[in-house]
Amino acid sequence: VPQKPKVSLNPPWNRIFKGENVTLTCNGNNFFEVSSTKWFHNGSLSEETNSSLNIVNAKFEDSGEYKCQHQQVNESEPVYLEVFSDWLLLQASAEVVMEGQPLFLRCHGWRNWDVYKVIYYKDGEALKYWYENHNISITNATVEDSGTYYCTGKVWQLDYESEPLNITVIKAPREKYWLQ
């Protein structure tokens, strides 16, 4: 049975600033045919037929649901892209994470400007402070890592706070063992 394709993002963030670039790639096994990919944005068929969809100089209208389809194979699960205009943007490698999977958070400055005196918060409590900006890396997410995250920091010596972001860690499905 052919696998459903999967949409991946490069860079891996699904929340980006207006004006930034992101490439969506439709991954699946044995999809070697050229010009055989269908892309759907908010349900509408895109003109792009390559396995990668490049969003250059992102606009607010680029926000929304993206799905891809190879040949007559099922559509991929949707990926949601959100385009922001702000000073700070908290980005996550995923907003719904399977328990045991890694989770990365990034406090991203508009125009890629340096952000410093960065504090990451979870459910209103400070998690981590760095003078220079660093990503937060959770190697094995647990259900306790679920919560509302945001970051604060300085850009051009002025204080800013990102919009909050809800992260949900879900329990991995149990393997089913059948008695022989």
């Epitope: 890629n112 340096d114 005196k117 010596q157």
Partner: antibody, heavy 121, light 110 residues
Amino acid sequence: EVQLVQSGAEVKKPGSSVKVSCKASGGTFSSYAISWVRQAPGQGLEWMGRIIPILGIANYAQKFQGRVTITADKSTSTAYMELSSLRSEDTAVYYCARVNPFGYYYAMDVWGQGTTVTVSS
Amino acid sequence: QSVLTQPPSASGTPGQTVSISCSGSSSNIGTNIVNWYQQLPGTAPKLLIYRNDQRPSGVPDRFSGSKSGTSGSLAISGLQSEDEADYYCAAWDDSLNGGIFGGGTKLTVL
């Protein structure tokens, strides 16, 4: 490579104003900021203020507040520093410098050649 | 009077190591980074060290910076005659909401 080229030397009377320009060439102008720094004869460096052209935001050292105006013209990649009510103590070399927010954490990484302003009656 | 305090002069012989200190307070160096600038005679200043200890490309590794608490330090090893210059530390001051410089240190290579 980015270069900052400043306007020529000026001789001014006390009480008058001077406007010094700083033109950036060979790089992006508006994503950076321009600071102005002065150096009186035989003295150290003194930060006057800065402008972030893309935001149109300028801020000034308290000492010069109300007497200095820093502006920028994005279309010509030029920053300006105007100092009013000049007095003899304003005789100095005035430098513009690019403030780098890309990994330099707002250090001034490129400097203009300096503009000598002499205030004399 | 400068907000950041540097010794007015320093000296050394070729090959030696010299250090220049820069003392500030909790509102500047204590909470922000230190940058160092070199000004050769008759020229514009040049960025020498940024982010406390980083060298821009083209700056020899003989120059190194460090920060501890409310003080910064610039070390120059293997001193050369062309290092004779004025050296300035700089930081952002949160109380003043502005940039500040040290008074400068004149380095003489004997």
